[in-house]
Interface confidence: low
Amino acid sequence: IVLRPSRVHNSEENTMRALTLKDILNGTFSYKTFFPNWISGQEYLHQSADNNIVLYNIETGQSYTILSNRTMKSVNASNYGLSPDRQFVYLESDYSKLWRYSYTATYYIYDLSNGEFVRGNELPRPIQYLCWSPVGSKLAYVYQNNIYLKQRPGDPPFQITFNGRENKIFNGIPDWVYEEEMLATKYALWWSPNGKFLAYAEFNDTDIPVIAYSYYGDEQYPRTINIPYPKAGAKNPVVRIFIIDTTYPAYVGPQEVPVPAMIASSDYYFSWLTWVTDERVCLQWLKRVQNVSVLSICDFREDWQTWDCPKTQEHIEESRTGWAGGFFVSTPVFSYDAISYYKIFSDKDGYKHIHYIKDTVENAIQITSGKWEAINIFRVTQDSLFYSSNEFEEYPGRRNIYRISIGSYPPSKKCVTCHLRKERCQYYTASFSDYAKYYALVCYGPGIPISTLHDGRTDQEIKILEENKELENALKNIQLPKEEIKKLEVDEITLWYKMILPPQFDRSKKYPLLIQVYGGPCSQSVRSVFAVNWISYLASKEGMVIALVDGRGTAFQGDKLLYAVYRKLGVYEVEDQITAVRKFIEMGFIDEKRIAIWGWSYGGYVSSLALASGTGLFKCGIAVAPVSSWEYYASVYTERFMGLPTKDDNLEHYKNSTVMARAEYFRNVDYLLIHGTADDNVHFQNSAQIAKALVNAQVDFQAMWYSDQNHGLSGLSTNHLYTHMTHFLKQCFSLSD
């Protein structure tokens, strides 16, 4: 059980107040984290509160401003990047968001040696992506879907690609589906470790069907947004990987990296690129039917100036029970011999663990094991491997950082974080300096987040980087809800849940229950993290009990739970939410007549199906930006879990798992359907089809659209959204305003 700070003395009780919706919408109780921008083994940059860029040296204890806020302000810079030779800084301004990760911006180069902006051969605008080489101060950037190279910031650019074309050919940046569902980055180019080579992807979207939607804006006629967007079963982008020598870029030009034969024989994806040395690169490929992944290690052949990927350096990862990997196929972390690597994949018992691959995957040495999962490999040095897992005390929703000494044989394991601030901190991530000389730990909860700096050799804490003192003080007079994380054992399935309880919770009373669900494959909602959000307010002020349940299909508890939903989305996720609700009712403090469910995106899909399950458990519910049919969603994501919508594959379940097919069942619930009209991700089409089916079935429902808003419903829409949902729930639960 995680008990949030609460006070029991009556004298203090009077000064305490509940959270308000305004607190949440204003972000009054938001927290800060501190991630050092490492520039060496012992130095990092940080943007101070007054916007100076400050360099800190841990070993000397000194700090100095390398770039003043005045310089930042002169170009309205919101971001910066120091060149590795420390001679230049790029300043980023005019940020303009595109999709989840992508944005365009204007870039200025500031010369630190003379304190002036570089004049002559200035960068064009707006730029889609820009980065320094890992050594020196070469620049690579993407402009109008083509890649350019500068040897020095003031030099004229060398154009690497010429075929870039809006919505057709993308060089060095991903198209929509690769950005959202495969790479999870705004870039698709990678410098080799010393900046000798530049690798990049080319995505050809020429034959991809286009999603078109209106953007209303302020003009007389709306604009039409067109995005090449492959839905399930549609034509996919064609990807090619090239590498160019940046020292003599015109000499032989870009060289294509060959695709493994077993991958190239049918539709495939490129999933990631990892440089090993300047002359060795590792590419990962994936069949369109995403249960076979191939890791290919390629070497530069000086004599031919080409890249050779011998079959002996191909490593196949295959899943027989689901799809390859977790959400994505994991990436390798190479060791110092530049050929062997560490990688997370399922062991024989179906738990994701770290394996060491020296020659073949079959001969992999398992490094971690147990009925828990290794989640991320942060760093491998000569003598240590740092990783995170949810092993400690068998709580899947925790994250602790471990060190395995690989320099000595056999390895020994140490939990770096388990006992540091045990009550406050159970969910960590980490950020390492070069050679892991130092590292920052960022604790996300369950208590108030705290960021600390540590010695990479001894793990000693050196200093607190951010402890959110102001937040701690602000919360002193707030009646926060209580939170508990527990599990239900049902039919050999473990359902972990988080319950958020009103501050004066009394087990003998009856409370309305709100289920908050996401439930997507490889997701996790029950986590030991701090949050003061909308559901905190609903518990604190409105006296609701809120529960989050991780059912089948969710992550970090083994493949049996994860892959249970393979090829049948929309079945077990819903069943498990319903099962949990029945168990909560049995606990005795839930008012059975006042139970609601809500979710966003995949959660909107699950909440809709739960409402239409015909159980009579739910009085009302909300779906925000829901998927309504898997035929409407992106190929890369959907097919990973569902296969293809073809007669000889899985069309039947595609058809059976739609929200529309259950329109009739919404008759006995109050349903609020919400969607942004400019949602590039889960298209408005999804809600339009639900609404049409409900109208055709003559079922009453409530709806709200947000004009020109995307999947995030940000800005003023957020305030309107949560106010609207609050009114809906209070009305459903007969709570006075």
Partner: nanobody, 123 residues
Amino acid sequence: QVQLQESGGGLVQAGDSLRLSCAASGRTFSSYVMGWFRQVPGKQRELVAAITSGLSTYYADSLKGRFTISRDNAKNTMYLQMNSLKLEDTAVYYCAAREGGGIWTSSTQYDYWGQGTQVTVSS
């Protein structure tokens, strides 16, 4: 569940040889990391030698090449060939099995244990 049974212990002279066996029953023997630990009264169990499913081996530094660990997956048996035995090799020798991979020196990382067999080296 795996049951482990050691055999082959006994009283020998310094400089002699001895071969310990560990017979396993139960689940697939081949997938376990197997190890030999020893313990003298009042001291912690220490890992003497271990072998992975992929036949990678580990030996304690103090052994100086005198011991050899091996396994026969077809017979579900692990062996420890001990040559040039010394007085300080006197101990109770335990056979241990660990699910999953990776050789660990800590006894807490092993899931299954035998009852132990006494090895006594006299002068």
